[in-house]
Interface confidence: medium
């Protein structure tokens, strides 16, 4: 059996095994996926679930990666000026990037802003940040688009027309997307061009109010969708995210932690024990939270799990 | 709760420079544009121009070019507005505003009281 | 630059009653027209903008209309705290210009 798409060595496929009675499929895991980190050894795991006898078309997941975030990171904001956002909703969520932007100034962070609706307008790009790092004057000049909300093409902009190194981005750096909307998309594609870059979407407001409408979201975000998919009703919530995100980009106050002295899916071993039943799969996470332990459910296409 | 606060009245002599303030608290001074606006007696009212205090960048109703200086002072968040040569002409409630930019113009969301200049040798 | 002529200049209503300002424009400014309340000893208070849009914590009984170059300010039934100057302001393109007010009074 050929095995595709991992750009990982697997040195221990197979150690943990599972068939789902109901069928004969089985999960093959992998524990050991072992990158490095700016220095730091990042352990999760790898799974194909075959079908029965090894016929037909294989599917294969990374089960608790940890994206890694090194020392410089530049980090787009992408941020929704459609029409449904009312003047006062539009200025809490430049409020919302100003205070990121305040709160990471002494960092190896670089920001670059880029407003979405029918078009897409860079408002400042890395190098306008790097000669004038303040948020209150990059963005003073901010011109509501008040038209759609085209997020596919918005975010093909950003991965080949900001992230440009004539544009003050770094070859080094971790590419980093957080999308802020207030709807659903309105036009269509793929987003295959943003594919390296580590992408936070942040839904606010009534048009998110069903599971639906929340799911539609989940196309435009890295994976796992629990967390990088952030669901908010009201533009004031906006305020508490960034503890939220600081958790999550653990390297956010300073240049780069060369030392990780917690964890949460970095160490986490995940497929050291599993369990297949009716084509719903479980792994174990022996490693997670700092060595808790705990499980990963996996969504049908082993692409997405939660915790 | 945004407030701006501005003194009741000024009273100057014709020809001295007069510098009228305004103290801003309950936002982010260095994020909002602000706007100053002239009432004539028994007039309607005027807009005269408009400071970022991010930058002290400023824009200017062309008619007030050659009358009016608008200054920030960040650390104390407070905004100025100087007139030059200042006649009974310029005797008015002279307002600041929070302006909110929006579609690349302003409207005002917060008002000061007013400080009615009174300009009489 | 926009001027804005404001109608009508005085109007006298009582408590309970509908009643319309209006505001045209010397060129079009498609739909930024902001209205704002005036009373003595209180700060201005904004109540619309963008011609329809009501500014939060202001009242439904007021409402705006109109486009282009025609602007309607209506308040229906009229509380004693509504009489007062009122005053509108084109937010299309700079310089930033008013109206030339309207005080309504108690009939």
């Known amino acids: 059996v050929t095995l595709r798409g991992s750009n990982y060595t697997s040195k221990y496929l197979g150690m943990t095994l599972a068939t789902d009675p109901t069928d004969g499929s089985i999960l093959a895991c992998d524990p050991g996926l072992s990158r490095t980190c700016d220095q730091n050894t990042y352990l999760s795991g790898l799974c194909y679930l075959f079908r029965q006898n090894l016929q037909g078309p294989m599917l294969q997941g990374r089960p608790g990666f940890q994206e890694c975030i090194k020392g410089n990171v530049d980090l787009v904001f992408l941020f929704d000026g459609s029409m449904s956002l009312q003047p006062d909703e539009f200025q809490k969520i430049l409020d919302f990037m100003k205070d990121v932007m305040k709160k990471l100034s002494n960092t190896s962070y670089q920001f670059a802003a880029v407003q979405f609706s029918t078009s897409y307008k860079t408002e400042f790009d890395f190098s306008d940040y790097v000669k004038r790092k303040d948020p209150d004057a990059l963005l003073k000049h901010v011109k509501h688009m008040l038209l759609l909300t085209n997020t596919f093409g918005a975010i093909n902009y950003v991965a080949t027309e900001v992230f440009r190194e004539e544009l003050g981005a770094r070859p080094d750096a971790t590419k980093v997307l957080i999308i802020i909307t207030d709807g659903e998309a309105t036009d269509s594609g793929n987003i295959d061009a943003a594919k390296d870059i580590i992408r936070y979407i942040i839904g606010i407001g009534k048009h998110f109010q069903t599971k639906e409408s929340q799911e539609t979201l989940h196309k435009f975000a890295s994976k796992p969708a629990s967390e990088f998919v952030k669901i908010l009703d009201t533009f004031e919530k906006l305020k508490d995210l960034f503890t939220e995100l600081q958790k999550k980009i653990y390297v956010i106050e300073g240049t780069s932690k060369q030392d990780l002295t917690s964890f949460n899916m970095e160490l986490s071993s995940s497929g050291i024990s599993a369990d297949l039943s009716r084509g719903h799969a479980v792994v174990g996470a022996v490693g997670a939270k700092d060595w808790a332990g705990g499980f990963l459910d996996l969504k049908a296409d082993l692409q997405d799990d939660t915790f | 709760e945004v407030q701006l606060q501005q003194p009741g009245a000024e009273l100057m002599r014709p020809g001295a420079s007069v510098k009228l303030s305004c103290k801003a608290s309950?936002?982010?001074?260095?994020?909002?544009?602000m706007n100053w606006v002239r009432q004539r007696p028994g007039q309607g009212l005027e807009w005269i121009g408009m400071?970022?205090?991010?930058?002290?960048?400023?824009r200017l109703n062309q008619k007030f070019k050659d009358k009016a200086t608008l200054t920030v002072d960040k650390s104390s968040s407070s905004a100025y507005m100087q007139l030059s040569s200042p006649t009974s002409e310029d005797s008015a409630v002279y307002y600041c505003?929070?302006?909110?930019?929006?579609?690349?113009?302003?409207?005002?969301?917060?008002w000061g009281q007013g400080t009615t200049l009174t300009v009489s040798s | 630059d926009v001027q804005i002529t404001q109608s009508p200049s005085y109007l006298a209503a009582s408590p309970g009653e509908t009643i319309s300002i209006n505001c045209r424009a010397s060129?079009?400014?498609?739909?930024?027209l902001a209205w704002y309340q005036e009373k003595p000893g209180k700060t201005n208070k904004l109540l619309i903008y963008?011609?329809?849009t009501l500014q939060s914590g202001i009242p439904s009984r007021f409402s705006g209309s109109g486009s282009g170059t025609d602007f309607t300010l209506t308040i229906s039934s009229l509380e004693p705290e509504d009489f007062a100057m009122y005053y509108c302001?084109?937010?299309?393109?700079?310089?930033?210009?008013f109206g030339t007010g309207t005080k309504l009074e108690l009939k």
């Open positions: 505003a929070r302006g909110i930019y929006f579609y690349g113009t302003t409207y005002f969301d917060y």
């Open positions: 309950g936002y982010s001074f260095t994020g909002h544009w």
């Open positions: 400071i970022h205090p991010s930058d002290s960048e400023t």
């Open positions: 060129k079009t400014i498609s739909k930024y």
């Open positions: 963008s011609g329809s």
């Open positions: 302001q084109q937010h299309n393109e700079y310089p930033l210009t």
